[in-house]
């Protein structure tokens, strides 16, 4: 088998053996090493020597195998844009941000750049659960049977109706999508508005 080429090596077809860790340098028609994450090109390659990589300075990073001559500046999560930090910047990874609680991502350019307040879901509905929190605005769905939600809120969940019998009580009024079951002591008289119903 042929010996493996070690950068720098000539490439006539403008492609390199390891596309992730090497790059084609067109001026000299050679393949050179990329710099690993967390580093940058301190000295470019030539026909007789490979790329020299240096570690990114504090508060800067490069996330991928690269041939960049600088590291990217770490940027804080902008609270004015509704963002909060979930992981700090390292030499190998930018600051990880997410939308603050009660907000969703309204502008996306490779990453979230702007969050807005989630819409309220009216009584009788709740926000449909999403795979990723903060990814989109609320989509309100009706409470399923036997559940209710009685506020206008972006985050309130539909709760199961109270089962009066579990508390040794009896149902005075059935629950709806917007209200809980009303329970009463079995010995208590019916409220006036219910008396007609009971007579029937």
């Amino acid at each position: 088998s042929q010996p493996q080429a070690v950068p720098p090596y000539a490439s006539e077809n403008q492609t390199c053996r390891d596309q992730e860790k090497e790059y084609y340098e067109p001026q000299h028609r050679i393949c050179c090493s990329r710099c690993p994450p967390g580093t940058y090109v301190s000295a470019k390659c030539s026909r007789i020597r490979d790329t020299v990589c240096a570690t990114c300075a504090e508060n800067s990073y490069n996330e991928h195998w690269n041939y960049l001559t600088i590291c990217q500046l770490c940027r804080p999560c902008d609270p004015v844009m509704g963002l909060e930090e979930i992981a700090p910047c390292t030499s190998k990874r930018k600051t990880q941000c997410r939308c603050q609680p009660g907000m969703f991502c309204a502008a996306w350019a490779l990453e979230c750049t702007h969050c807005e307040l989630l819409s309220d879901c009216p009584p009788g509905t709740e926000a449909e659960l999403k795979d990723e929190v903060g990814k989109g605005n609320n989509h309100c769905v009706p409470c399923k049977a036997g559940h209710f939600q009685n506020t206008s809120s972006p985050s309130a969940r539909c709760q199961p109706h109270t089962r009066c019998e579990n508390q040794g009580l009896v149902e005075a009024a059935p629950g709806t999508a917007q209200s809980d079951t009303t329970c009463k002591n079995p010995l208590e008289p019916l409220p006036p508005e219910m008396s007609g119903t009971m007579l029937m």
């Epitope: 301190s42 000295a43 026909r47 007789i48 490979d50 020299v52 990589c53 240096a54 001559t69």
Partner: antibody, heavy 123, light 108 residues
């Protein structure tokens, strides 16, 4: 601007080690886009590349001298050094330190040189 | 290793004349990696041209470089008194870096 200055003994005995230091002034040896090298010139003759190094490490040597050559960097002193072991009379030469510009914005020629120091190998 | 041969060994010209110095390589080299230097007695070499044709900082435009492959030329359009020196070509296309043996440019 950047200046280079060689220093070291002017005479070395045969079989001993020649040690020279180059001090960089007017700029940092750690600035990045440079290799720091040694070139020698035998009396009345042409130039011979010995080797060079980047501040991070990565020395490169002339194969004809590689077994006897060590080039190192001391960033705290802004210096780089040459050690040539087991010297013989044929190592008598003017030794120059020089900067090889290897940044993305320039080519790999020796753009700045020290004034040179004569080293005689003699008992 | 790549051997660089310079011609002529000595060139005798007068100030104001044009000088043409040749450098031949034993193997084809990328013109990106050819440089020219001059050296005056008792001084270090000084970079004149890199990349075969690009003048180094501070070098007057009477100096020009050309060529490719194995044949390179340094031209000085109008010789000034300070141009009389030894001229070296250098390649850094292949390890080890090598220099030509030099051309001595002397006043006629």
């Amino acid at each position: 601007q950047v200046q280079l200055q060689e220093s070291g003994p002017g005479q070395v005995k045969p079989s001993q080690t020649l040690s020279l230091t180059c001090t960089v002034s007017g700029g940092s040896i750690s600035s990045g886009g440079y290799f720091w090298g040694w070139i020698r010139q035998h009396p009345g003759k042409g130039l011979e590349w010995i080797g060079y190094i980047h501040y991070i490490g990565s020395p490169y040597y002339n194969p004809s001298l590689k077994s006897r050559t060590t080039i190192s960097v001391d960033t705290s002193k802004n210096q780089f050094s040459l050690k040539l072991s087991s010297v013989i009379a044929a190592d008598t030469a003017v030794y120059y330190c020089a900067r090889d510009c290897s940044s993305v914005n320039c080519q790999d020629a020796f753009d700045i040189w020290g004034q040179g120091t004569m080293v005689t190998v003699s008992s | 290793e790549i051997v660089l041969t310079q011609s002529p060994g000595t060139l005798s010209l007068s100030p104001g004349e044009r000088a043409s110095l040749s450098c031949w390589s034993s193997q084809s080299i990328d013109s990106t990696y050819l440089a020219w230097y001059h050296q005056k007695p008792g001084q270090a070499p000084r970079l004149l041209i890199y990349g075969a044709s690009t003048r180094a900082t501070g070098i007057p435009d009477r100096f020009s470089g050309s060529g490719s492959g194995t044949d390179f030329t340094l031209s000085i359009s109008r010789l000034e008194p300070e141009d009389f020196a030894v001229y070296y070509c250098q390649q850094y296309s292949s390890s080890p870096i090598t220099f030509g043996q030099g051309t001595r440019l002397e006043i006629k």
